[in-house]
Interface confidence: medium
């Protein structure tokens, strides 16, 4: 054998953000001819020796970190990247607003603000069509998302979620959508 067994990929379909009681499928994908897959939920004793886990109705207890690996002969692969499966709709939706407003000139600045009645300390902002959170993939400790030097690429529909660092995989319902409209043409860089 010339190298370690490459790590498989683990994905959630249709998304890793799953509303409570909605279905989701976790799929572990390794090279062809794998002998055995192991898919497990971290920090629990829950695992299965299959590549696909179908969850017909998302529950709070199923939210968390998952990863998978596979076995060929007596060798185990390196583990997949961890997948964070988030249950949404656990708490009431926050409100999302734009300051100074949802219509902004190209080259201007705008701040998207996520507000909640609860004492949540973390917030995530998503732009429709983008699988990853907007801007910085780390957690945010402020409810404000400044967008400096807006371009046409920033226009679109945004939603935010709020949650607590004590239960990082139990999120609110998404805010109502906010349509960010960018007017004018992009400034030519000097």
């Amino acid at each position: 054998q010339s190298g370690p067994l490459p790590k498989p990929s683990l994905q959630a379909l249709p998304s890793s953000l799953v509303p409570l009681e909605k279905p989701v499928t976790l799929r572990c994908q390794g090279p062809p001819g794998v002998d055995l897959y192991r898919l497990e939920k971290l920090s629990s004793s829950r695992y299965q020796d299959q590549a696909v886990l179908f969850i017909p109705a998302m529950k709070r207890s199923l939210a968390g970190r998952y990863r998978c690996s596979y076995q060929n002969g007596s060798l185990w692969s390196l583990p997949s990247d961890q997948l964070e499966l988030v249950a949404t709709g656990v708490f009431a939706k926050p409100s999302l607003s734009a300051q100074p407003g949802p219509a902004v000139s190209s080259g201007g600045d705008v701040t998207l603000q996520c507000q909640t009645r609860y004492g949540f300390d973390q917030f995530a902002l998503y732009k429709e069509g983008d699988p990853a959170p907007y801007k910085n993939p780390e957690r945010w400790y402020r409810a404000s998302f400044p967008i400096i030097t807006v371009t046409a690429a920033h226009s679109g529909t945004y939603r935010c979620y709020s949650f607590s660092s004590r239960d990082p995989y139990l999120w609110s319902a998404p805010s109502d959508p906010l349509e960010l409209v960018v007017t004018g043409t992009d400034p030519i860089p000097e």
Partner: antibody, heavy 114, light 106 residues
Framework: QVQLQESGPGLVAPSQSLSITCTVS????????VNWVRQPPSRGLEWLGM???????DYQSTLKSRLSISKDNSKSQVFLKMNSLTTDDTARYYC????????WGQGTSVTVSS | DIQMTQSPSSLSASVGGRVTITCKAS??????IAWYQHKPGKGPSLLIH???TLQPGVPSRFSGSGSGRDYSFSISNLQPEDIATYYC????????FGGGTKLEIK
């Protein structure tokens, strides 16, 4: 082939910040995570934190408040920043690839002293 | 956080002999343990991951076993080049190293 190379300041004054860069080759930072590990003089290895391929981060709980890990995928560089240094932060700092850290750099020595 | 208790902290053995190092986790780590060899002036080298899977190029003199909270690592037919410090690492939940075992040859 897979390589990781750390570069740091060598000497840092107490209460100042430490910045170290890990430059990688032979693999993509979008597909693999990078860890930071340190070894104080005559002590064992200590895991500091990790940045995953998707950019999310994990930190050792005792250092979380003063540690930040970021990266530039296009430059194949990962950055460690640690604030409020004390002499206890004197160590050799290593970057290592993914889980369970199959490739390591040679490390860069950091001394915290006035 | 998961703690890893590694023992012994040092040991001495003869060329051709066998040594065993143990690591005990503070909770079940589901076989997610790796073993490293660390020599002065170099970065550590991964020998074994997922309890017992040898990295390519690592001699079969090195082996690992265990489950739940208890794990062990052995070197048989000890060679002079095996002089190093050995560490266990759990990667079930975040990452934690054991305290290390310094191996010397008699």
């Amino acid at each position: 082939q897979v390589q990781l190379q750390e570069s740091g300041p060598g000497l840092v004054a107490p209460s100042q910040s430490l910045s170290i860069t890990c430059t990688v080759s032979g693999f993509s930072l979008t597909g693999y995570g990078v860890n930071w590990v340190r070894q104080p003089p005559s002590r064992g290895l200590e895991w500091l934190g990790m940045i995953w391929g998707d950019g999310s981060t994990d930190y050792q709980s005792t250092l979380k408040s003063r540690l930040s890990i970021s990266k530039d995928n296009s430059k194949s560089q990962v950055f460690l920043k640690m604030n409020s240094l004390t002499t206890d932060d004197t160590a050799r700092y290593y970057c290592a690839r993914d889980l369970p850290m199959d490739y390591w750099g040679q490390g860069t020595s950091v001394t915290v002293s006035s | 956080d998961i703690q890893m208790t590694q023992s012994p902290s040092s040991l001495s053995a003869s060329v051709g002999g066998r040594v065993t190092i143990t690591c005990k986790a503070s909770q079940d780590i589901n076989k997610y343990i790796a073993w490293y060899q660390h020599k002065p002036g170099k970065g550590p080298s991964l020998l074994i991951h997922y309890t017992s899977t040898l990295q390519p190029g690592v001699p079969s003199r090195f082996s690992g076993s265990g489950s739940g909270r208890d794990y062990s690592f052995s070197i048989s037919n000890l060679q002079p080049e095996d002089i190093a410090t050995y560490y266990c690492l759990q990667y079930a939940l975040l990452l934690t190293f054991g305290g290390g075992t310094k191996l010397e040859i008699k």
